[in-house]
């Protein structure tokens, strides 16, 4: 969480951002809130990016003002216009690119004062893994697949019964470049699995951590997955 304060002749207002991560090719949110003002026509929101000459986005007098917008963000940004009056200056970024990573500044002017806060935005690819029993294999085998990751993640297997066990000798992980030549498909195979046990396939890079669990019993198979972004720090 980054909290910034204005340093103008007018009063300073508190602006708060949250570091976040964008998933390449999908839409992302750059989060920013500020002390709300009841005078909508006086509110100005400017998003800037370090190293970029033009503005990322500008909202003033109740609408977008994009004449100064940098070419790399053309047609890809929007604020939540209906939420500005209650202090939400968050930016929606469409079709996130690897090059969108960097330091952004959320700069706010209201009738009460000015303020700004920086935000670190990471970009990469992350996806939910799915763990299945590989019936084609000669022994009891689990296959963990996740379609899109970048940068290259680590994959670690764990088991509920053999807690702390190292499965690196009985697993094999491969990374296959996807058609857009940036993200990769992750496939990890775990051999010699036993029934009545829960196995977890954990995929992690510096942006996200995802886990796929599978519980195999004689009568049924239960699966569960979850994904967590690693760098949601507020400013």
């Amino acid at each position: 969480l980054i909290i910034g304060f204005g340093i103008s002749g007018r009063h300073s207002i508190t602006v708060t951002t949250v570091a976040s991560a964008g998933n390449i090719g999908e839409d992302g949110i750059l989060s920013c809130t500020f002390e709300p003002d009841i005078k909508l026509s006086d509110i100005v929101i400017q998003w800037l990016k370090e190293g970029v000459l033009g503005l990322v986005h500008e909202f003033k007098e109740g609408k977008d003002e994009l004449s100064e917008q940098d070419e790399m963000f053309r047609g890809r940004t929007a604020v939540f216009a209906d939420q500005v009056i209650v202090g939400n200056a968050s930016l929606r970024l469409k079709n996130v690119q690897l090059t969108d990573a960097g330091t952004y500044k959320c700069y706010i002017i209201t009738s009460k004062g000015k303020g700004n806060a920086n935000l670190e935005y990471k970009t990469g690819a992350f996806s939910m893994p799915e763990v299945n029993v590989d019936y084609n294999a000669s022994s009891e085998t689990l296959r963990c697949e996740a379609p899109r990751w970048f940068p290259q993640p680590t994959v670690v297997w764990a088991s509920q019964v053999d807690q702390g066990a190292n499965f690196s000798e009985v697993s094999n992980t491969s990374f296959e470049l996807n058609s857009e030549n940036v993200t990769m498909k992750v496939v990890s195979v775990l051999y010699n699995v036993t029934i009545n046990n829960t196995y977890s396939c954990m995929i992690e890079n510096d942006i996200a951590k995802a886990t796929g669990d599978i519980k195999v019993t004689e009568s049924e198979i239960k699966r569960r997955s979850h994904l967590q972004l690693l760098n949601s720090k507020a400013s």
Epitope: E35, P36, K39, L40, S41, G62, A81, D82, I85, K112
Partner: antibody, heavy 117, light 107 residues
Amino acid sequence: EVQLVQSGAEVKKPGASVKVSCKVSGYPFTSYWMHWVRQAPGQGLEWIGAIYPGKSDTEYAPKFQGRVTLTADTSTSTAYMELSSLRSEDTAVYYCTSTWTHYFDYWGQGTTVTVSS
Amino acid sequence: DIQMTQSPSSLSASVGDRVTITCQATQDIVKSLNWYQQKPGKPPKFLIYYTAQLAEGVPSRFSGSGSGTDYTLTISSLQSEDFATYYCLQFYEFPPTFGGGTKVEIK
């Protein structure tokens, strides 16, 4: 659940003052503007003013400037509207209304103020 | 101050009718307009925000549209519980101002 609970009806004499309270629960009281709106019998809605409890910033409609005072007690999440020098035209239902998710999204039940000699 | 002219001031309609209420601002309010429904003895109820977005729990027969200075509230098929007074509110310019209201009565 968001709730705005106002104080009870008041009967006042011309020239007197009235203070209406509005107790808030269900959202962060200090971080959002609280407004006051009134409605005379059979009439429309009229904005009086607003307060930002976190900083005690206030804004008033020019018509009420100097005659209305908005305050807030952050320890009890209660907003107050005091109207002085009452006249018969001030007979109305007074509402508090929040701007939490949107402008005037939640409303108090209203407080009837009757000014009569 | 921005003046909001609401029309008609009252209308009579039957259950099932399509009802349209308009609000005209004295200047561009950039879609910064909400609609409220009020029944006798009750506070206004938040209906539509930012011109066209339905508030939580509001039936889909209500819709809003408009831009610039002209805005419309439409009830596609009037129900018995919709007989009430409707107000528009502009919050673009300070101070916020309401329309005069439209009373929807049973024909």
